[in-house]
Amino acid sequence: MVPPPENVRMNSVNFKNILQWESPAFAKGNLTFTAQYLSYRIFQDKCMNTTLTECDFSSLSKYGDHTLRVRAEFADEHSDWVNITFCPVDDTIIGPPGMQVEVLADSLHMRFLAPKIENEYETWTMKNVYNSWTYNVQYWKNGTDEKFQITPQYDFEVLRNLEPWTTYCVQVRGFLPDRNKAGEWSEPVCEQTTHDETVPS
């Protein structure tokens, strides 16, 4: 009897949908795996007889529920299928946005870039898919614990009247108010303000 794949889960970030599993202990030899998806009442092969423990399902529609399954195989034997259901638009993790930060005197000027949909060749972003897309920004004085949060209305924001010659750290994440769903925070960007007068151009 061939044991089934273990710890089957979907790892989906920005609609890059990778079904992952672990190979069970099996004394007779090396197992292969077949992963399928349900497409209008019929299961279709996605990865056949692979020795890998993952399979890319990024071509699935972002909308609606999908049933995926994977089994282990050895020679003419195979395990039972292990099924999972997955709805990309609900379940995918929203990766960290990009952020550009520029210091102008006692202000930090920030521009945000929504994460790209991973499996596409064009410039579609997560902001295209989610109508309610907005950003959360948090910032703090470097070396302190107190953090301040703001929700910019646009793809840019300016933090004004900051303390001069002080290092501030900023990070941003995507947020979906209608789903109450937050994305991953970007890595902090830390910049030092200069004096509190406008720099002459």
């Epitope: 349900l38 699935l60 972002k62």
Partner: nanobody
Framework: QVQLQESGGGSVQAGGSLRLSCAAS????????MGWFRQAPGKEREAVAA???????SYADSVKGRFTISKDNAKNTLYLQMNSLKPEDTAMYYC????????????????????WGQGTQVTVSS
């Protein structure tokens, strides 16, 4: 909310032609992948033709050289020109859309499209 509405189906003699249309609301055709599928009674739904946002097209072997898929982004309408129709083309024809997808690879499976029309019937008699 994305809505797709097919039209242009009907009855035709073998060797005749039809042009199916699919009008979209709540969605811009230039931003995604589109496809035509069909389903004959007692059979599974199958892909007929697909077009990506970059305009690249692909066809089922059974319709190559006879059917042409196209889209008019200005009118937000998808078309399927069907020539030299055969009785085996008789089916319900469905328009499908997947917003914000690109021309990286042809989408050829029901599960790869998120939005569907209600279908339009095509009947070809011999």
């Amino acid at each position: 909310q994305v809505q797709l509405q097919e039209s242009g189906g009907g009855s035709v003699q073998a060797g005749g032609s039809l042009r199916l249309s699919c009008a979209a609301s709540g969605y811009t055709y230039s931003s995604g992948c589109m496809g035509w599928f069909r389903q004959a009674p007692g059979k599974e739904r199958e892909a007929v033709a697909a077009i990506n946002s970059d305009g690249s097209t692909s066809y089922a072997d059974s319709v190559k050289g006879r059917f042409t898929i196209s889209k008019d982004n200005a009118k937000n309408t998808l078309y399927l020109q069907m020539n030299s129709l055969k009785p085996e083309d008789t089916a319900m024809y469905y328009c499908a859309a997947e917003p914000y997808c690109s021309g990286g690879y042809p989408r050829w499976s029901v599960a790869e499209f998120g939005y569907w029309g209600q279908g339009t019937q095509v009947t070809v008699s011999s």
